[in-house]
Interface confidence: medium
């Protein structure tokens, strides 16, 4: 932002009324009036170019310093070319000197040269040659100097003529302020520019109404330079929740709009399934029956729990059941649907029922399922099972009602056979098993599966109608994994545990019952 100038003295604007002191009195500097652009203008002029040594002083009135620390002095003046006078005026000069003196009081007409300190010699960029003078072309020069730091109540300026033909048309003394500024939604007060050129005054800004420093952000600061320019902005303010930036201010969100945090973003329209918000809303309330999960952004539509899984089937396969379902017809407006499967078993004889989570095995954890199928195994025969599949989403926890579908299945399968090792040699294993007598009539055959431990690529199967089998052609001193499963008309029965049996080593041959 451009510096603001506070004028302390303006000769040109005073219309010749300032009455500056000349020394020596009545000689040298003289107040003159002229006409320029059909307007009367005043100037202090001196032109004693033919008179040898000159020491003519013009002193301003006492200027009250006020809050100024560094003053700027702008001079507009014209200087005649010494060669425009007959004989070149050997004592003629083309410069004059600028002085200042600080004081706490006005000395009036008591003028003392010794109190003045020289600021600079003022030389023109352009001198007025004869042809310009005759044609009344005033070659106006503009020079600026600055002085600081000032410490006393006021000051004088003085102009020393040493034999030039010069006219002072304007003397303007001012100091600079960094103007009041709104930047980054922060207000910076009008600040007096410092007096030392390299230094920058740090100024703290204040957030405008309804603006805040964002969490973790820097407080707004600017630097006021000597020339009254604001530099190096640091930090910023953001419109708080419920307000948005409109030009240099924060304006409340219109009804039907909201803003949930301090940010640079504008207010957003209330999302679907929300009630119309009042002015300055930070969020939009959900319609009845709709909810917002704690992690849901305020910009997301309100949602509700899903309906039940649309279609559920339970397909029994021996001691296993495959449960399949389709997603709910109404997702509640969310994509974070998960499913939970629970199991209940009932004994047909007694009609007693209870949870069966501990005794069955699921193909994947039954809670938080994202797929729409699961296999349940290790089911007990002659048992009725009821499976419940519940659909949940991010807002299900906010309501007490549940969305689920159930399917029942009866298990008419055998129990797993109980297996024993009857005998072994270096190349064979004799295995027997048993199942409860009531189930034996339903068994068609038994299937014995065996393989070397550690060899997952190949296995052998033997089927038999009896309750024992000898597995031949085995490798000596080798552990085999053996499982027995009953086969019924309905399919596979429950498999036995997998047993580890080892053949004998060649040096310890002979049958050994275990």
């Amino acid at each position: 932002a451009q510096g603001k100038e506070v004028v302390l003295l303006d000769f040109a604007a005073a219309g010749g009324e300032l009455g500056w002191l000349t020394h020596p009195y009545g000689k040298g500097w003289d107040l003159m009036q002229n006409i320029m652009n059909d307007m009367p203008i005043y100037m202090y002029s001196v032109c004693n170019v033919m008179s040898g040594d000159q020491d003519n002083w013009l002193r301003t009135n006492w200027v009250y310093r006020g809050e100024a620390e560094r003053i700027f002095i702008e001079l507009k003046f014209t200087v005649r070319d010494c060669n425009s006078f007959p004989g070149g005026a050997s004592s003629c000069k083309e410069t004059f000197n600028l002085y200042y003196a600080e004081s706490d009081l006005d000395y009036g007409t008591n003028f003392q040269k010794r109190l003045f300190t020289k600021i600079d010699t003022i030389a023109p960029d352009e001198i007025t040659v004869s042809s310009d003078f005759e044609a009344r072309h005033v070659k106006l020069n503009v020079e600026e100097r600055s002085v600081g730091p000032l410490t006393r109540k006021g000051f004088y300026l003085a102009f020393q003529d040493i034999g030039a033909c010069v006219a002072l048309l304007s003397v303007r003394v001012y100091y600079k302020k960094c103007p009041e500024l709104l930047q980054g939604l922060a207000h910076f007060p009008e600040t007096i520019a410092g007096s030392d050129a390299p230094s920058l005054a740090t100024v703290a800004g204040t957030c405008v109404d309804h603006a805040v420093v964002p969490p973790g952000g820097e407080e707004p600061r600017m630097h006021c330079a000597v020339d009254g320019e604001w530099l190096v902005p640091i930090g910023q303010c953001l419109c708080q929740a419920g307000y948005e930036k409109v030009e240099d201010a924060c304006q409340a969100c219109s009804p039907g709009f909201f803003k949930f945090e301090a940010s640079e973003s504008p207010c957003l329209e209330c999302p679907e399934h929300t009630l119309p918000s009042p002015e300055g809303a930070t969020s939009c309330e959900c319609e009845e029956g709709f909810f917002r999960a704690p992690q849901d952004p305020a910009s997301m539509p309100c949602t509700r729990p899903p309906s039940a899984p649309h279609y559920l089937t339970a397909v029994g396969m021996g001691a296993k059941v495959e449960l399949r379902w389709t997603p709910p017809q109404d997702s509640g407006g969310r994509e974070d649907i998960v499913y939970s499967v629970t199991c209940e078993q009932c004994w047909p004889e007694s009609g007693e029922c209870g949870p069966c989570e501990a005794s069955v095995r699921y193909s994947e954890p039954p809670h938080g399922l994202t797929r729409t199928s699961v296999t349940v195994s290790d089911l007990e025969p002659h048992m009725n099972y009821t499976f419940t599949v519940e659909a949940r989403n991010g807002v299900s926890g906010l309501v007490t009602s549940r969305s689920f579908r159930t399917a029942s299945v009866s298990i008419n399968q055998t129990e797993p056979p109980k297996v024993r090792l009857e005998g072994r040699s270096t190349t064979s294993l004799s295995v027997s098993w048993s199942i409860p007598p009531p189930q034996q009539s339903r068994v068609w055959k038994y299937e014995v599966t065996y393989r070397k431990k550690g060899d997952s690529n190949s296995y052998n199967v033997r089927r038999t109608e009896g309750f024992s089998v000898t597995l031949d052609d085995l490798a000596p001193d080798t552990t085999y994994l053996v499982q027995v499963q009953a086969l019924t008309q309905e399919g596979q029965g429950a498999g036995s545990k997998v047993h580890e049996f080892q053949t004998l080593s060649p040096e310890g041959s002979g049958n050994l019952a275990v």
């Epitope: 002229n34 002029s45 005033v138």
Partner: antibody, heavy 128, light 107 residues
Framework: EVQLLESGGGLVQPGGSLRLSCAAS????????MAWVRQAPGKGLEWVSR????????HYADSVKGRFTISRDNSKNTLYLQMNSLRAEDTAVYYC?????????????????????WGQGTLVTVSS | DIQMTQSPSTLSASVGDRVTITCRAS??????LAWYQQKPGKAPKLLIY???NLHTGVPSRFSGSGSGTEFSLTISGLQPDDFATYYC?????????FGQGTKVEIK
Amino acid sequence: EVQLLESGGGLVQPGGSLRLSCAASGFTFSHYMMAWVRQAPGKGLEWVSRIGPSGGPTHYADSVKGRFTISRDNSKNTLYLQMNSLRAEDTAVYYCAGYDSGYDYVAVAGPAEYFQHWGQGTLVTVSS
Amino acid sequence: DIQMTQSPSTLSASVGDRVTITCRASQSISTWLAWYQQKPGKAPKLLIYKASNLHTGVPSRFSGSGSGTEFSLTISGLQPDDFATYYCQQYNSYSRTFGQGTKVEIK
């Protein structure tokens, strides 16, 4: 020494024309603003017209505007005043006058000029 | 146009007298004023310019003062050669008007 010598005056009938000349010597003519000033018999001085050092600008008194024309020839060091539509009230001694800013010890020229050097004058009589 | 009024119209004085002629402008002319001396049958001669500056070769008994609208020409010790008519002239505007003149005659 600066010398200005007017010529061309005489008796002329009302409505007639006359051309005055002013021969300059003893100074650099092309540096000077030149003017004509007249003085009716027994009366005071009246400024008539002026011309800048290089031929412009030119100014005229309201009483002669549109009838008189001032000009100069710097190569001949001569100033002219062409007077047309002459009237009885134009009867006067016409002086040629000059101003050189080099002799004017002021920083800014006055809005107009004064006259440092004068000729001896030439009489113009307008009468029937 | 700016009107220039001189007073008195005629002034009778003796050699050695101090005489003052005044000139009033109808509006402010700052210090843009010149004084001339004219003797019968002769061309005017410049005495003073810019109200108080003495023209080259003019005796120091002549002095001028004033600014704005009131001006004066003073001859501090009248000499026989000084009996003449004196004119003021403003050059604050292009009209460059003269006063009507003041005749200084021998008493």
